[in-house]
C-alpha cells in the first residue's frame, strides 16, 4: 500500500481466483483514543472500532472511502484504490491501446517545435468517474523539471455503439534548451483513477522524436504565364522554432484529386515556393518536416487548383531566413567551409536515416538507454551551438562537434561494427563511416589539433548486445548530426562570405 | 501488369514526319500520365513531354516545342507521339512510359527505333 | 535547365564488390532525383525514387542517398546481372533531365 495524495491510497494486488489480498491496517488521523468506530462508504454499518481498523483487502468491494467516527462526528477519512496485477502485468482497463506507432501505446505525445513544450493525449470510452493527474520530468535518476498542466477533455467521438473520450495535456520543460541535442528523455506518467481502481500509464520520449510542425501557411498560388505550370508559394508555421536558417524545415508539394488512387504530381523543396502542375478538380497540398531529423510529417495544407488564391490558415508574414546579424569571424581561429560542411552534415543526416530507419520499431529505452547514450558525446546547451553561441564564437562549437565526428567515426570502426553479427553488405554504415572522416576532416583546421574524447569500452560480448548497441549508437548519431547540420546551415547562410 | 506497346521500328527522310504509337494495358488508361523519352545511339536518355490521356494536357520540353506533338485516343487506350520536320540527330530510340507519378518514369515501352536518311 | 552531371563515365569493378555511383545537379535540386539502369538493347528500369526509396522487385543491394546538389547510388555486392548503364533524373524542375550515364563495367 502506498499513499496516492493526502488520505488516497492505493493497495496493489495479485489478481487471481482465491487471491489472499492484502491487510491493510487504517489509522484515524486523531488524537482521540477511544469511542472511535469505522464505516464504509455511505454504509453505517459499523466495521470496527478503536484508533486502527485492519481490513483483509481482496476485491472491489474491499475498497472505498473507509472513515473514522466518535459520537456522530467524522473524525478522517481514508480512501483506498485497487491497482491490479493480473499475470505480473498491471491493468490497463482505463485507457485504450492507441496501437500507433505500436501495440500498447496509452498514451501520445506531440510537439509542434523545440521549445520543450508538449502534448500528450490519450482515449477512454469511459465517460463518468475519473479522474487523471499528470506528472513529468527530464531523465529519471536524476530528474529535471517539467510542469504539466491539468488533464482536460479535448475530444469526443462516437466509435461504432461506442462514444470515445479523448483527453490531453500541455506540458512545458522548465529550463528547455531548443538547440542541444537530447541525452536524457522526457517521462511522463498519468495516474488514472475510474471509480476504485487505480492504473498509472507512461511514456518515454525525446522532444525530437514527437515533432510534428503545424501545416505551411499562407499557401499561394501564381499561374505561369503560357504554361500548365503554376508557382505554389507557402511560409513557415508561426509556431516552429526560430531563426529558420538553423530550425529548416524541408517540404512536399503535391498535386491530386479527391481520390488517393489517382494520379498525383509530387516533388520536395528545401525552399518555400515549387512549381507544379495543375489539374482541374485537384488540389495543391504543402506538408513540411524537419530538414535534418525525420520526425513525423505536418498535417497538409491546401489550396484548390481552379483557385489561385491563398489558402485558409494562418495569415501575417512570419518571415523564413536567417535573418539577423552576420557571425563573427571566429577570434584565435580560422573559418570552416560552412557551405561545405553543410553538404556535407546534410549528407550524414540522409546516411544515418537509411543505416537505422527503424525509428519506434525497437524501443531501446527499455534497455537502459540513459547509461548508454551518457558514453557518447552529446552536443549540449553550454557547447555554443545555439545561433546566439554561434554568433558570439563558433570555435567552441566546432571543437565540441569535432570531437563527436571522431568519437563516432572510430565507434563506427570498431569491433561493435566489423564484429558478429556481420552487417549487411547493402548497408551504409561504410557510407556514413567516410563521411564522418570526411566532415572531422573538413573541420580540423591546419596544423591545429583539438583534442578527442577517449572511447569508453562499449565493447559487448554477445552478438546480440553488439545488434543492440549498433542500433543505439545510431539514434544517437541521426540526433548529433542533425544538430550539426543545423549548426552548419546556420552558418553558411549566416557566415559564409 | 501494366504494359506498353509500341510501333514498329520506321525510317524517315530528313524534313518528313514520323507518328510513333504506344498501347497500354493492364491498367485503366486515363489513371496514368504518359511521358516519351529518346535515346539516340550510344548516347544518353532525353525527356521530350509528356500528355495526361485524361484531358489532354501536355507539357513539352523547350527543345522539341513547336515540332512535337502527342496525343491519345482513349477509346483504344493509345498515345501518339508525332515528332516533325526530322533531322539526322534525330535519328534515336524513342521509348513511351507510364505513371501515376507525373515527374518519374516506372513503366517503359520496348522502344521505336526512328531513322532519320537521306 | 538543371544540367546532372553523372561520374564517373565509366566504372570497372570486380563481381562481389562495392560500386559507388556519383550524380551532382548544377543547382539544389532537394531529393527530386531518381535512378535508371539500362542493359544493352533494353528499355530503362527505375531502381530508386526521390533519391533514396526503394522500388519494390529491386535487390536491397541498390540503394540511394544524398540531397541538394549530391547524390549517390551504392551498389553493395556486385552481381553478374549489375553490369550496365546507371542514369540519374532530376525532377525538381521542367524540363526534366538526366546525366549522361554511368557504365559499369567487369573489372
Known amino acids: 500500500i502506498w499513499e496516492l495524495k493526502k488520505d488516497v491510497y492505493v493497495v496493489e494486488l495479485d489478481w487471481y481466483p482465491d487471491a489472499p489480498g492484502e491487510m491493510v491496517v487504517l489509522t484515524c488521523d486523531t488524537p482521540e483514543e477511544d469511542g472511535i468506530t469505522w464505516t464504509l462508504d455511505q454504509s453505517s454499518e459499523v466495521l470496527g472500532s478503536g484508533k486502527t481498523l485492519t481490513i483483509q483487502v481482496k476485491e472491489f468491494g474491499d475498497a472505498g472511502q473507509y472513515t473514522c467516527h466518535k459520537g456522530g462526528e467524522v473524525l478522517s477519512h481514508s480512501l483506498l484504490l485497487l491497482h491490479k496485477k493480473e499475470d505480473g502485468i498491471w491493468s490497463t482497463d482505463i485507457l485504450k491501446d492507441q496501437k500507433e506507432p505500436k501495440n500498447k501505446t496509452f498514451l501520445r505525445c506531440e510537439a509542434k517545435n523545440y521549445s520543450g513544450r508538449f502534448t500528450c493525449w490519450w482515449l477512454t470510452t469511459i465517460s463518468t468517474d475519473l479522474t487523471f493527474s499528470v506528472k513529468s520530468s527530464r531523465g529519471s535518476s536524476d530528474p529535471q523539471g517539467v510542469t504539466c498542466g491539468a488533464a482536460t477533455l479535448s475530444a469526443e467521438r462516437v466509435r461504432g455503439d461506442n462514444k470515445e473520450y479523448e483527453y490531453s495535456v500541455e506540458c512545458q520543460e522548465d529550463s528547455a534548451c531548443p538547440a542541444a541535442e537530447e541525452s536524457l528523455p522526457i517521462e511522463v506518467m498519468v495516474d488514472a483513477v475510474h471509480k476504485l481502481k487505480y492504473e498509472n500509464y507512461t511514456s518515454s520520449f525525446f522532444i525530437r522524436d514527437i515533432i510534428k510542425p503545424d501545416p505551411p501557411k499562407n499557401l499561394q498560388l501564381k499561374p505561369l504565364k503560357n504554361s500548365r505550370q503554376v508557382e505554389v508559394s507557402w511560409e513557415y508555421p508561426d509556431t516552429w522554432s526560430t531563426p529558420h536558417s538553423y530550425f529548416s524545415l524541408t517540404f512536399c508539394v503535391q498535386v491530386q484529386g479527391k481520390s488517393k488512387r489517382e494520379k498525383k504530381d509530387r516533388v520536395f523543396a528545401d525552399k518555400t515556393s515549387a512549381t507544379v502542375i495543375c489539374r482541374k478538380n485537384a488540389s495543391i497540398s504543402v506538408r513540411a518536416q524537419d530538414r535534418y531529423y525525420s520526425s513525423s510529417w505536418s498535417e497538409w495544407a491546401s489550396v484548390p487548383c481552379s483557385g489561385s488564391g491563398s489558402s485558409r490558415g494562418g495569415s501575417g508574414s512570419g518571415g523564413s531566413g536567417g535573418g539577423g546579424s552576420k557571425l563573427r569571424a571566429v577570434p584565435g581561429g580560422s573559418s570552416p567551409a560552412w557551405t561545405q560542411c553543410q553538404q556535407l552534415s546534410q549528407k550524414l543526416c540522409t546516411l544515418a536515416w537509411s543505416a537505422h530507419p527503424l525509428v519506434g520499431h525497437m524501443d531501446l529505452r527499455e534497455e537502459g538507454d540513459e547509461e548508454t547514450t551518457n558514453d557518447v558525446p552529446h552536443i549540449q546547451c553550454g557547447d555554443g551551438c545555439d545561433p546566439q553561441g554561434l554568433r558570439d564564437n563558433s570555435q567552441f562549437c566546432l571543437q565540441r562537434i569535432h570531437q563527436g565526428l571522431i568519437f563516432y567515426e572510430k565507434l563506427l570502426g570498431s569491433d561493435i561494427f566489423t564484429g558478429e553479427p556481420s552487417l549487411l553488405p547493402d548497408s551504409p554504415v561504410g557510407q556514413l563511416h567516410a563521411s564522418l572522416l570526411g566532415l572531422s576532416q573538413l573541420l580540423q583546421p591546419e596544423g591545429h589539433h583539438w583534442e578527442t574524447q577517449q572511447i569508453p569500452s562499449l565493447s559487448p560480448s554477445q552478438p546480440w548486445q553488439r545488434l543492440l548497441l549498433r542500433f543505439k549508437i545510431l539514434r544517437s548519431l541521426q540526433a548529433f548530426v542533425a544538430v550539426a547540420a543545423r549548426v552548419f546551415a546556420h552558418g553558411a547562410a549566416t557566415l559564409s562570405p | 501488369q501494366v504494359q506498353l506497346v509500341q510501333s514498329g521500328a520506321e525510317v524517315k527522310k530528313p524534313g518528313a514526319s514520323v507518328k510513333v504509337s504506344c498501347k497500354a494495358s493492364g491498367y485503366t488508361f486515363t489513371d496514368y500520365y504518359l511521358h516519351w523519352v529518346r535515346q539516340a545511339p550510344g548516347q544518353g536518355l532525353e525527356w521530350m513531354g509528356w500528355?495526361?490521356?485524361?484531358?489532354?494536357?501536355?507539357e513539352y520540353a523547350p527543345k522539341f516545342q513547336g515540332r512535337v506533338t502527342m496525343t491519345t485516343d482513349t477509346s483504344t487506350s493509345t498515345a501518339y507521339m508525332e515528332l516533325r520536320s526530322l533531322r539526322s540527330d534525330d535519328t534515336a530510340v524513342y521509348y513511351c512510359?507510364?505513371?501515376?507519378?507525373?515527374?518519374?518514369?516506372?513503366?517503359w515501352g520496348q522502344g521505336t527505333m526512328v531513322t532519320v536518311s537521306s | 535547365e538543371i544540367v546532372m552531371t553523372q561520374s564517373p563515365a565509366t566504372l570497372s569493378v570486380s563481381p562481389g564488390e562495392r560500386a559507388t555511383l556519383s550524380c551532382r545537379a548544377s543547382q539544389s535540386i532537394s531529393i527530386n532525383l531518381h535512378w535508371y539502369q539500362q542493359k544493352p538493347g533494353q528499355a530503362p528500369r527505375l531502381l530508386i525514387y526521390f533519391a533514396s526509396q526503394s522500388i519494390s522487385g529491386i535487390p536491397a543491394r541498390f540503394s540511394g542517398s544524398g540531397s541538394g546538389t549530391e547524390f549517390t547510388l551504392t551498389i553493395s555486392s556486385l552481381q553478374s546481372e549489375d553490369f550496365a548503364v546507371y542514369y540519374c533524373q532530376q525532377s525538381n524542375s521542367f524540363p526534366l533531365t538526366f546525366g549522361g550515364g554511368t557504365k559499369v563495367e567487369i573489372k
Open positions: 500528355i495526361d490521356p485524361e484531358n489532354g494536357d501536355t
Open positions: 512510359n507510364a505513371n501515376k507519378e507525373l515527374r518519374y518514369f516506372d513503366v
